[in-house]
Interface confidence: low
């Protein structure tokens, strides 16, 4: 806690300017009026202070406002922003994009900290869904950010939001997240035609369900193997030989590069072994010629 | 042992066909994509065209659409590529190759010569 | 222009390891394997390295395929007398619909 001590005879600062960063921290405590700083915040950042007279000035804004920073300060924190708790940040009310950016460009190039998560919460918490501005803007800081959301979370992302999301944006969402993701694109991009709409379905097809893929199928996309590779299993198992070789394309000789992994080991399991050599590929473990094939979910939903 | 030998090039004049055959041996044809990849003198490897096992898809070089057409007789284990409206940047040595994504087998080439 | 670009030349003398590059784009060599080929003088291709990095039987293990992100390469140790050929990379393009070759690179035992 800085002591309180009279300010010393003419160091009373008429403006927050470069010459505060002589003073020492108890000099900065007594001189520096927290009205003059919270409506000249703007100017701090292009001062140096040192990390010490920074946690000076945030003790004078936090005397100033205990229930929390008004708006007008917020947007201008600068590096000030570093300095502030998740339980600080729990008290605003950020209502601004401008606010929001401006914030996390003081935070750009590192991990989302603690504090940053607080802040998105509390801002789009505020704003009842997650649109496509804010959706825009934090996948632009963070291109993880969507798949940081629970499935629940994600559940209020509209659909019109769709359209901000890049393939990046999804690389490290898990299957859970794409179910509840999939069938927002498919509503977001339905007006497009063929090949526009599945380079920008591509991505969120870890979520497709078979009918679906099927229908792809049907309209020489050609699918790359990575996409396949991250297709649900359970979706890709009912495909038959033709179907696998449709959606592919091209790109059907890859699979047996990826003949150990799922989903493919499993879908060729599922596959009758005549029908898996007509692909010329050398795929094995497929059902012996001659064998009877019972689907047993079938038997299951019929008893 | 895997044999792949292409026929039915020659000289044509500017505007003129041609039917290229590619007899393959030594595997199970009906199985695998095939495709047609050329060289011009003293240039690289240009792909042409590739055809499905089943001949249900082809694809195409921008260079040749509508020009060229691709096709097999799976019953006589031969791949034709017939070519016309040929013009002098056509003029190279064609090559029959196994496979759409990695040309694992190739024929020997056979040289088209396209000049009036 | 070759949709892959290749150095048109390399160079080793007998014994030493060369590499050879090859760059695209994330709609070929970033979301396909990329396969390499090599044409000895008067001949026609031979496949070399395929998905990227295997080696089909029969081709020594002085020859290896790498790839990351949108480059792949090719390396030869020991290099000999009889490498001396032009070495081709090749992948599906997505955004074309098309294969593609690099332009080809003539490698030279000094």
């Known amino acids: 806690e800085v002591e309180k001590t009279a300010c010393p005879s003419g160091k009373k600062a008429r403006e927050i300017d470069e010459s505060l960063i002589f003073y020492k921290k108890w000099e900065l405590e007594a001189c520096v009026d927290a009205a003059l700083l919270a409506t000249q915040m703007d100017r701090v950042n292009a001062i140096p202070f040192t990390y010490e007279q920074l946690d000076v000035l945030k003790h004078k804004l936090d005397e100033l406002y205990p229930q929390g920073y008004p708006e007008s300060v917020i947007q201008h924190l600068g590096y000030l922003f570093l300095k502030m708790s998740p339980e600080d940040i729990r008290k605003w009310n950020v209502t601004s994009l401008e606010t929001l950016k401006a914030l996390l460009e003081v935070n750009k190039g590192h991990e989302m900290s603690p504090q940053v998560a607080t802040l998105i919460d509390r801002f789009v918490k505020g704003r009842g869904q997650l649109d496509k501005d804010t959706l825009d803007t934090l996948t632009a800081f963070y291109p993880g950010y969507l798949c940081s959301l629970s499935p629940e979370e994600l559940s209020s992302v509209p659909p019109s939001s769709i359209w901000a999301v890049r393939p990046q944006d999804l690389d490290t969402c898990d299957p859970r997240q794409l179910d509840v993701l999939y069938p927002k694109a498919r509503l977001a991009f339905q007006n497009m035609n063929g090949s526009e709409y599945f380079v920008k379905i591509q991505s969120f097809l870890g979520g497709a369900p078979t009918e679906d893929l099927k229908a792809l199928s049907q309209q020489n996309v050609s699918m790359d193997l990575a996409t396949f590779m991250k297709l649900r299993t359970d979706a890709v198992l009912p495909l038959t030989v033709a179907e696998v070789q449709k959606l592919l394309g091209p790109h059907v000789e890859g699979l047996k590069a990826e003949e150990r992994h799922r989903p493919v080991r499993d879908w060729i399991l599922r596959q009758r072994q005549d029908d898996l050599d007509t692909l010329g590929l050398g795929l094995q473990g497929g059902i012996p010629n001659g064998y009877l094939v019972l689907d047993l979910s079938m038997q299951e939903a019929l008893s | 042992e895997v044999q792949l030998l292409e026929s039915g090039g020659g000289l044509v004049q500017p505007g003129g066909s041609l039917r290229l055959s590619c007899a393959a041996s030594?595997?199970?044809?009906?199985?695998?994509?095939m495709s047609w990849v050329r060289q011009a003198p003293g240039k690289g490897l240009e792909w042409v065209s590739s055809i499905y096992p089943n001949g249900s898809s082809k694809y195409y070089a921008d260079s040749v659409k509508g020009r060229f057409t691709i096709s097999r007789d799976n019953s006589k284990n031969t791949l034709y590529l017939q070519m016309n409206s040929l013009r002098a940047e056509d003029m190279a040595v064609y090559y029959c190759?196994?496979?759409?994504?990695?040309?694992?087998?190739w024929g020997q080439g056979t040289l088209v010569t396209v000049s009036s | 222009q070759s949709v892959l670009t290749q150095p048109p030349s390399a160079s080793g003398p007998p014994g030493q390891r060369v590499t050879i590059s090859c760059t695209g784009s994330?709609?070929?060599?970033?979301?396909?394997?990329v396969s390499w080929y090599q044409q000895l003088p008067g001949t026609a291709p031979k496949l070399l390295i395929y998905y990227d990095s295997h080696r089909p039987s029969g081709v020594p293990d002085r020859f290896s395929g790498s790839k990351s992100g949108t480059s792949a390469s090719l390396a030869i140790g020991g290099l000999r007398s009889e490498d001396e050929a032009d070495y081709y990379c090749?992948?599906?393009?997505?955004?074309?619909?098309?294969?593609?070759f690099g332009g080809g690179t003539k490698l030279t035992v000094l």
């Open positions: 090749g992948a599906w393009d997505d955004s074309l619909n098309a294969y593609v």
């Open positions: 190759a196994k496979n759409l994504l990695t040309f694992d087998y």
């Open positions: 030594g595997f199970t044809f009906s199985n695998y994509a």
């Open positions: 994330s709609s070929n060599i970033g979301n396909n394997s």
